[in-house]
């Protein structure tokens, strides 16, 4: 484990002549940072800079050009990889003073003149002097304060509720701070707050836009954290709401996003007492241009019944909104004329779903099926086909003579989809053909008999079955069946000799 | 030699309540952030909440949030962890632990069994 | 949250062995990564911090690698007293998570 870095000069505290230089050494094991009294905007006659030498160890060198009053506090130089948010800084320190005889007191910020106590809590009212030796005395409206004072941290004791100011004399000069306003606070368990981001989803060039409420507490502190903000991209603001409750609303914008500004935007509200804090987070993406994805829950070739009602669900994702269309066989489709709907609903925030729908499929809803989704950046479509299901039917059945040779060929047109098969039957003896066990299957490899198959179109089909002789009277059966259903029809195919007496007759 | 060590630790009803202390000695207390960690009988570690050294500063996992409060007394160098509308499935023995290896936990207690049960 | 997944959720090996112990982020923790060793009824021991840091104390068998998202710890010659469960944890931010812990058993 790393020793606690060292510090040159090797004192716990300094007093340095206003106006003149100082500087502060630290050497550590590990890169070492400086934590030191002033902000960043005050902070431009503060210089760090690394410093090589020959002893193996990291030097970090912070250099004040010329010393103020402002520069008195405290100077930690700690290992900067090493340090975990809820462990005190852990490092070596030195307390610098710089005298002012004009400046009695350390500068302060204006939140640093409310103190604010919880339950009866001892406070630190932080009037710092920037000469160790300065006598202070502690004052409210009923006299002087005894409380105890330390000139690095202030008094510190248990106050009641009002203005205080501490009073110095420097070579007979008396000063004065302005008053610090000491407010009771109850502790509340819990911080009630809310974040609201209109939207998630971004391009390039938009505005983010994120608010964080914090609703019956005057005294917050509210911090942001967002992927720009050590550019300082964003641009905050407070807006207090008095009517009907207490709310204050930070908004948080990020003119001009980049895909760099993609990631998780979190405000952490702090109760004034820093006791109770509350945390939400909200994840943002910027897309370098709009986009569209389409994720269809069906295939490419779908079938529907005849008269069934049918559904086809498209989900797309898409941003900016899209515009949601469906064709017919690249026609757009017209709605009123057809038993055909479509809608487009918003799911979420990039999520839509597009339903075709239905109503009652007929043969002539078969066809190729495209939705188009558009928006100002990109275009995407999906097309499929959709067939209807017409179970089979016998349009159909004729016999057709050879003449004198005695053939006979027999004709079966059936419809339907899918596309039927056609099957034969004979039943020889005709006294008995309504019995069902007298009929038989003719098969194709039976001599002097040749069936054959011809699609007419995409739903018809003609199957042909040529007897070659046929001596007595025999019955066809002409069976059409596909996966909705079958038909039968027969027919009587009479012998030619038969046939001219029955003629002469 | 540094030391954690917890108390109150027991058997409750589910939907009551129950504190629990960790006195600490050995180390500058003040300066660090401690935590619970939770280990139900048989199962692995659970990290529960945190408080900042200076108690500016609390977290909780989600399934005590709301329920659970961490708070500690630098002056008597103790952490507390009070429990309320206690579950079944908080049964676990309790330990606390702090430290200041680049987060991780130098310090831990022996730890304390709360049993949650009707 | 960050999830932490650990690989092999036991193993069987012999005193002298080499045994190593993964321990997966699901989001870059760059090298804030702890290994613990637990024995039956006692509190956790830290071995190693900043993903490959000894703690004082800790036998130097013991040695932690890694970074990002992707971590080992690793007993180069594993001795009688190793046996026990080894749990990883984040170290940054909050939740600390831990991993689901790795048994190491006599074979």
């Known amino acids: 484990q790393l020793s606690l870095p060292s510090i040159l000069p090797n004192e716990n505290e300094k007093v340095v002549q206003l106006n003149s230089s100082f500087s502060l050494r630290c050497f550590g094991e590990s890169e070492v940072s400086w934590q030191y009294p002033m902000s960043e905007e005050e902070s431009s006659d503060v210089e760090i800079r690394n410093e090589e030498n020959n002893s193996g160890l990291f030097v970090t060198v912070l250099e004040v050009s010329s010393a103020s009053a402002a520069h008195t506090g405290l100077y930690t130089c700690y290992y900067n990889h090493t340090q975990t948010e809820e462990n005190e800084l852990e490092g070596r320190h030195i307390y610098i003073y710089v005298p002012d005889p004009d400046v009695a007191f350390v500068p302060l910020g204006m939140t640093d003149y409310l103190v604010i106590v919880e339950d009866d809590d001892s406070a630190i009212i932080p009037c710092r002097t920037t000469d160790p030796e300065t006598p202070v005395t502690l004052h409210n409206s009923e006299g002087v304060v005894p409380a105890s004072y330390d000139s690095r941290q202030g008094f510190n004791g248990t106050f009641t509720v009002g203005p205080y100011i501490c009073e110095a004399t420097v070579k007979g000069k008396k000063f004065q701070t302005i008053p610090f306003n000491v407010y009771a606070l109850k502790a509340t368990s819990e911080l009630d707050l809310e974040m609201e981001a209109l939207k998630t989803v971004y391009k390039s060039g938009e505005t983010i836009v994120v608010t964080c409420a914090v609703f019956n507490n005057e005294v917050v502190d509210l911090q942001w954290t967002y992927p720009g903000e050590v550019k300082g991209k964003g641009i905050t603001m407070l807006e207090e709401i008095k009517v009907p409750s207490i709310k204050l609303v930070y908004t948080l914008t990020v003119p001009e996003a980049t895909v760099k500004d993609s990631g998780d935007y979190e405000c952490a509200a702090r109760q004034a007492t820093r006791e109770v804090k509350e945390m939400k987070k909200v994840t943002i993406s910027v897309h370098e241009k709009g986009f569209i994805e389409i994720k269809p829950t069906f295939s490419q070739l779908e079938a529907v019944n005849l008269h069934e009602v049918k559904h086809f669900v498209v989900e797309v994702r898409a941003y900016p909104p899209p515009r949601i269309s469906w064709l017919k066989n690249n026609l757009t489709l017209i709605e009123n004329l057809t038993e055909i709907t479509t809608d487009v609903e918003k799911i979420q925030e990039i999520r839509y779903r597009s339903k075709l729908k239905l109503i009652r499929a007929k043969e002539e809803d078969s066809g190729h099926y495209t939705i188009v989704a558009q928006n100002e950046d990109a275009v995407k479509s999906y097309t499929f086909e959709l067939l209807t299901q017409v179970p089979s039917s016998i349009l159909d059945l004729v016999d057709d003579h050879h003449g004198s040779t005695g053939g006979q060929t027999v004709r079966c047109t059936a419809e339907g989809t899918p596309l039927p098969d056609i099957e034969w039957m004979i039943c020889k003896d005709i006294k008995k053909c309504n019995n069902e066990t007298s009929w038989t299957i003719l098969a194709n490899n039976v001599s002097n008999i040749i069936t054959e198959i011809h699609s007419r179109d995409r739903s018809t089909v003609e199957g042909r079955v040529t007897f070659a002789k046929v001596e007595e009277t025999i019955a066809v059966r002409c069976l059409a069946k596909n996966l909705l259903g079958a038909e039968n029809r027969e027919l009587k195919l009479v012998a030619p000799t038969l046939r001219s007496e029955l003629t002469v007759a | 030699q540094v030391q954690l060590v917890e108390s109150g630790g027991g058997v409750v009803q589910p939907g009551r309540s129950l504190r629990l202390s960790c006195a600490a000695s050995g180390f500058t207390f003040s300066s660090y952030g401690m935590h619970w960690v939770r280990q139900a009988p048989g199962k692995g570690l659970e990290w529960v909440a945190v408080?900042?050294?200076?108690?500016?500063?609390?977290y909780y996992v989600d399934s005590v949030k709301g329920r659970f409060t961490i708070s500690r007394d630098n002056s008597k160098n103790t952490l507390y962890l009070q429990m309320n509308s206690l579950r079944a499935e908080d049964t676990a023995v309790y330990y606390c632990?702090?430290?200041?290896?680049?987060?991780?936990?130098?310090?831990w207690g022996q730890g304390t069994l709360v049993t949650v049960s009707s | 949250d960050i999830q932490m997944t650990q690989s092999p959720s036991s193993v069987s090996a012999s005193v002298g062995d080499r045994v190593t112990i993964t321990c997966r982020a699901s989001?870059?923790?760059?090298?804030?990564l702890a290994w613990y060793q637990q024995k039956p009824g006692k509190a956790p021991k830290l071995l190693i911090f900043a993903a490959s840091s000894l703690q004082s104390g800790v036998p130097s068998r013991f040695s932690g690698s890694g970074s990002g998202t992707d971590f080992t710890l690793t007993i180069s010659s594993l001795q009688p007293e190793d046996f026990a469960t080894y749990y990883c944890?984040?170290?940054?931010?909050?939740?600390?998570?831990f991993g689901q812990g790795t048994k190491v058993e006599i074979k």
């Open positions: 408080i900042w050294y200076d108690r500016s500063n609390k």
């Open positions: 944890q984040r170290t940054s931010s909050f939740p600390r998570t």
């Open positions: 632990a702090g430290g200041r290896s680049r987060g991780a936990f130098d310090y």
């Open positions: 989001q870059d923790i760059s090298s804030w």
